[in-house]
C-alpha cells in the first residue's frame, strides 16, 4: 500500500513520541560520535518537516523516501569528515547506495567512554528538571553504543527507565529502589543488544533464508500447536520486521512490529494459548511480551516423523518437487516436537537431512540410502548434550569466576591472536552461561546454553571482522552460522602461534587496584591471565592456578598494607619473578 508521503504515513501511524524516539535512535546509531545536542537538533528538524507533510502530503519534498530525507539530514552535519573520516564519502552517493554506505560504517565497538552512573540524587534531579531530555539522552547513549539495538525494543527499555525514575525518585530510599532496577535494565539491555546483533548478522552475512530457517525453528518450538501455514506467515512477517531494523529502516520496522503484534493478538486461537496476558498490555510491553513468551504445550497425538520423512519411498519425489516446503515442514515438525533442543541443533539436523537427501536421491536405491538418516542425527544431538553436561558440571564445581577463568584459558589457547580485551569480554560472557542455564531443568538446558553461546560467539565474530587477526576465527565465523559453536568448540591449542614476548609492564599493578569494584578487579586479573597464556600457551592448569592464586594473595596483601603503593612497587616485581619461574 503506497502513500503519497512516506514520512507523513509513519508519523501518523507511530505518533509523535515514538516517531521522535525512533528518529533519534536511527541518527545515533549512524553517527555514533555526534554530540547529543546535534542529534536533538536534527530530530527536531525532521519532526517539524514530518508535521508539514501530515498537514499537506503534497508539500515540497514530502514524497521523498525516508532514506533520502534522513540521509540528506545526516549529511548536513558540518564536522562529518573530521569526526568520521571516510564515512563522509557516503554523502557523495545516491540512494540506496548512500544508506548501504552508512550501514557499513556502523561501529560495533565505538571508541566511547563507559557510561558512568551519577549519584542517585543527581539523576533524580535531572529527571525532574527535564524528563523529556533525560529520556532522550538515554536513547542516544544506548543507541550510539549499540548501533544494531532493536529500535522498537529500545523504546520499551526507555519506558521502563522512565517508570523506574518516576517510582524511585519519590521513594524513601531512592537508591535501594532505583539501583537494582537500573542494574536489571543494563543487563537486560546488553543481552537484548547481543541477541539482535546475531539476528542482523544472520540476515546480513547469511541471507534471509538463514534467518527464516532460524525463525521457523524458534517459532515452531514456541507455538507447537500452530499449523505450518500460520508459522510460515509469522516467519515472513518477522523476517520483514528484522530486515527493516537491521537495515536502518526503524520507522517501518516499528510500524510493522506493531502490526505483527496486532495480528498475533487477533489470531491467538490459531497461534498459542500463552499469548493472552501479553495481549492485554499496551503496545511496547505487548510486543516485548510476545517476543519473550514461553513455549506453548505440545499438542497431543503427534505421530512419528519417520513415516513421512524416512520410511516413505516417496521422500525423494516430495523433496524434488517441493524442496522448500518439504524441508520447511520437516524443520517445523521436528522443532515443535523438540523444545528440548537448541535452535542451532535443529538447524544442523535440517541441514544434515537435506544433505542426506541430496546424496541419496541421486543414488541407485534412494530409500535404502536414506533409511538410516535419523540414526545419523544421534551424534549431532549428543555433542551439545555432552557439552552442556560437562560445562555445567565444571561450573558447579568452580563457581562463575573460576569457570570464566577456565574458559579464558581455553579460548586464549584456541585463538591467541585475538586481542586481550576481546578475549576477556567474550570469555566472561561465555562463562555467564553457567548461572543463566545450569540451574534450569534438563529439558531447558540445551536450548538456553547453546543459543546463548551463539549470541556470545557472534560478538566475537563481529569484533574480529572489524580487525581480523586469526584465520581460525574467520573460518569459524564465516563458513556456517549453525556450526559456529561446534567449530569453536573443536578448536585446539594453536601450535603455529609464536608466544608473546614477556612484558613486565603488563604485569605491573598499582594501588588503584584496591579501589576497584569486585567486577573491575576480576577483569584486571582475567586480563593478566590472558596475557600469561599468550606468553606461555602450553602452561598447565596447575601452573596457571598457582600463578593466579599468588596474584590474588599479592593483591590482597598490598590492599591491606598501610602504604599500598609502596607494597605494590616492592611485591610486584617479586610476583612477576616468581610467576616467570613457575611457568618456566
Amino acid at each position: 500500500d503506497t502513500h503519497k508521503s512516506e514520512v507523513a504515513h509513519r508519523f501518523k501511524d507511530l505518533g509523535e513520541e515514538h516517531f521522535k524516539g525512533l528518529v533519534l535512535v536511527a541518527f545515533s546509531q549512524y553517527l555514533q560520535q555526534c554530540p547529543f545536542e546535534e542529534h536533538v537538533k536534527l530530530v527536531n528538524e525532521v519532526t517539524e518537516f514530518a508535521k508539514t507533510c501530515v498537514a499537506d502530503e503534497s508539500a515540497e519534498n514530502c514524497d521523498k523516501s525516508l532514506h533520502t530525507l534522513f540521509g540528506d539530514k545526516l549529511c548536513t552535519v558540518a564536522t562529518l569528515r573530521e569526526t568520521y573520516g571516510e564515512m563522509a564519502d557516503c554523502c557523495a552517493k545516491q540512494e540506496p547506495e548512500r544508506n548501504e554506505c552508512f550501514l557499513q560504517h556502523k561501529d560495533d565497538n565505538p571508541n566511547l567512554p563507559p557510561l558512568v552512573r551519577p549519584e542517585v540524587d543527581v539523576m533524580c534531579t535531572a529527571f525532574h528538571d527535564n524528563e523529556a531530555t533525560f529520556l532522550k539522552k538515554y536513547l542516544y547513549e544506548v543507541a550510539r553504543r549499540h548501533p544494531y539495538f532493536y529500535a522498537p525494543e529500545l523504546l520499551f527499555f526507555a519506558a521502563r527507565y522512565k517508570a523506574a525514575f518516576a517510582e524511585c525518585c519519590q521513594a524513601a530510599d531512592k537508591a535501594a529502589c532505583l539501583l537494582p532496577k537500573l542494574d536489571e535494565l543494563r543487563d537486560e539491555g546488553k543481552a537484548s543488544s547481543a541477541k539482535q546483533r546475531l539476528k542482523c548478522a544472520s540476515l546480513q552475512k547469511f541471507g534471509d533464508r538463514a534467518f527464516k530457517a532460524w525463525a521457523v525453528a524458534r517459532l515452531s518450538q514456541k507455538f507447537p500447536k500452530a499449523e505450518f501455514a500460520e508459522v510460515s506467515k509469522l516467519v515472513t512477517d518477522l523476517t520483514k520486521v528484522h530486515t527493516e531494523c537491521c537495515h536502518g529502516d526503524l520507522l517501518e520496522c516499528a510500524d510493522d512490529r506493531a502490526d505483527l503484534a496486532k495480528y498475533m493478538c487477533e489470531n491467538q486461537d490459531s497461534i498459542s494459548s500463552k499469548l493472552k496476558e501479553c495481549c492485554d498490555k499496551p503496545l511496547l510491553e505487548k510486543s516485548h511480551c510476545l517476543a519473550e513468551v514461553e513455549n506453548d504445550e505440545m499438542p497431543a497425538d503427534l505421530p512419528s516423523l519417520a513415516a513421512d520423512y524416512v520410511e516413505s519411498k516417496d521422500v525423494c519425489k516430495n523433496y524434488a518437487e517441493a524442496k522448500d516446503v518439504f524441508l520447511g515442514m520437516f524443520l517445523y515438525e521436528y522443532a515443535r516436537r523438540h523444545p528440548d533442543y537448541s535452535v542451532m541443533l535443529l538447524l544442523r539436523l535440517a541441514k544434515a537431512y537435506e544433505a542426506t537427501l541430496e546424496k541419496c536421491c541421486a543414488a541407485a536405491d534412494p530409500h535404502e540410502c536414506y533409511a538410516k538418516v535419523f540414526d545419523e542425527f544421534q551424534p549431532l544431538v549428543e555433542e551439545p548434550q555432552n557439552l552442556v553436561k560437562q560445562n555445567c558440571e565444571l561450573f558447579e564445581q568452580l563457581g562463575e569466576y573460576k569457570f570464566q577463568n577456565a574458559l579464558l584459558v581455553r579460548y586464549t589457547k584456541k585463538v591467541p591472536q585475538v586481542s586481550t580485551p576481546t578475549l576477556v569480554e567474550v570469555s566472561r560472557n561465555l562463562g555467564k552461561v553457567g548461572a543463566k542455564c545450569c540451574k534450569l531443568p534438563e529439558a531447558k538446558r540445551m536450548p538456553c546454553a547453546e543459543d546463548y553461546l551463539s549470541v556470545v560467539l557472534n560478538r566475537l565474530c563481529v569484533l574480529h571482522e572489524k580487525t581480523p587477526v586469526s584465520e581460525k576465527v574467520t573460518k569459524c565465523c564465516t563458513e556456517s552460522l549453525v556450526n559456529r559453536r561446534p567449530c569453536f568448540s573443536a578448536l585446539e591449542l594453536d601450535e603455529a602461534y609464536v608466544p608473546k614476548a614477556f612484558n613486565a609492564e603488563t604485569f605491573t599493578f598499582h594501588a588503584d587496584m584496591c579501589t576497584l569494584s569486585e567486577k573491575e578487579k576480576q577483569v584486571k586479573k582475567q586480563t593478566a591471565l590472558v596475557e600469561l597464556v599468550k606468553h606461555k600457551p602450553k602452561a598447565t592448569k596447575e601452573q596457571l592456578k598457582g600463578v593466579m592464586d599468588n596474584f590474588a594473595a599479592f593483591v590482597e596483601k598490598c590492599c591491606k598494607a598501610d602504604d599500598k603503593e609502596a607494597c605494590f612497587a616492592e611485591e610486584g616485581p617479586k610476583f612477576v619473578a616468581a610467576s616467570q619461574a613457575a611457568l618456566a
Epitope: F228, E230, P303, A307, D308, Y309, D314, K317, E321
Partner: antibody, heavy 120, light 108 residues
Framework: EVQLVESGGGLVQPGGSLRLSCAAS????????MNWVRQAPGKGLEWIGH???????YYATWAKGRFTISRDNSKNTVYLQMNSLRAEDTAVYFC??????????????WGQGTLVTVSS | AFELTQSPSSLSASVGDRVTITCQAS??????LAWYQQKPGQPPKLLIY???DLTSGVPSRFSGSGSGTDFTLTISSLQPEDFATYYC??????????FGGGTKLTVL
C-alpha cells in the same frame, strides 16, 4: 471450529462426471495432506488419494486416470474430480486430513461425507 | 502396494468381555498402523496411531500393539458404546495408504 464439510454429491448417470468439494474451516488446508476416502453401502473404507502440502497428488492404483484431486488454498477447499463414473463408484465420499503436510496417515479429522449415486 | 488382512471380519461379544482384533500386513510397515472405530452414519474415529499410541480422549480400555506385519487392537472390557465396526490402516511406506476390510463387533 475445526471442521471439514463435503459437498457436490448426488445422482449421476454412468459415464458422467462429478466434482466434489471439501471446505475446511478453522485451519489452513495448505498445511496438510488432504485425503479422499470412500465407502460403498455396507462395505469397508477405500482410500482414493491425497494432495500434499507440496501440491503433489497421489492416488490408489485403481483411481489413477479417472479421479483427480486438486486444491484452492485461497478458498481453503480441496476437490475431487470424478470422470467416467460407474455403478460401483456409488459410495459415501469422505474428506480426511493427514497428520502433517506429507502424511498418508493417520486421519484424526474427517468430514461427515457426501453420497454419490451412479445410476441410470 | 501392501495389503492389510483384518480378522475376524465379524465378532460377537458381551459387555465386559476382552476383545482382540488382528491386522496383518503383506509386508513390513514398521509401526505405522492406525485403528478406527466407525458407527453407522458417522465418519471413522481415530483410536490408535503408530500401532500403540492412544489418541487423546479415547478411553484407556483401548490398546494397540505390534510392529512389522502383525498388529492387534484390544478392548479390555467391552462397554455398550463399543459395538461398532473397526478398521486398521497402514501408512508411511509410501505416499499411499491402505485400510483393512473391517471387523464388525456386535452384541452376543
Amino acid at each position: 471450529e475445526v471442521q471439514l464439510v463435503e459437498s457436490g454429491g448426488g445422482l449421476v448417470q454412468p459415464g458422467g462426471s462429478l466434482r466434489l468439494s471439501c471446505a475446511a474451516s478453522g485451519f489452513s488446508l495448505s498445511s496438510y495432506a488432504m485425503n479422499w476416502v470412500r465407502q460403498a453401502p455396507g462395505k469397508g473404507l477405500e482410500w482414493i488419494g491425497h494432495i500434499n502440502a507440496g501440491d503433489i497428488a497421489y492416488y490408489a492404483t485403481w483411481a489413477k486416470g479417472r479421479f483427480t484431486i486438486s486444491r484452492d488454498n485461497s478458498k481453503n477447499t480441496v476437490y475431487l474430480q470424478m470422470n467416467s463414473l460407474r455403478a460401483e463408484d456409488t459410495a459415501v465420499y469422505f474428506c480426511a486430513r493427514g497428520a502433517g503436510g506429507f502424511s498418508t496417515g493417520p486421519f484424526k479429522l474427517w468430514g461427515q461425507g457426501t453420497l454419490v449415486t451412479v445410476s441410470s | 502396494a501392501f495389503e492389510l488382512t483384518q480378522s475376524p471380519s465379524s465378532l460377537s461379544a458381551s459387555v465386559g468381555d476382552r476383545v482382540t482384533i488382528t491386522c496383518q500386513a503383506s509386508e513390513s510397515i514398521n509401526s505405522r498402523l492406525a485403528w478406527y472405530q466407525q458407527k453407522p452414519g458417522q465418519p471413522p474415529k481415530l483410536l490408535i496411531y503408530d500401532a500403540s499410541d492412544l489418541t487423546s480422549g479415547v478411553p484407556s480400555r483401548f490398546s494397540g500393539s505390534g510392529s512389522g506385519t502383525d498388529f492387534t487392537l484390544t478392548i479390555s472390557s467391552l462397554q455398550p458404546e463399543d459395538f461398532a465396526t473397526y478398521y486398521c490402516q497402514g501408512y508411511g511406506g509410501s505416499s499411499t495408504t491402505t485400510f483393512g476390510g473391517g471387523t464388525k463387533l456386535t452384541v452376543l
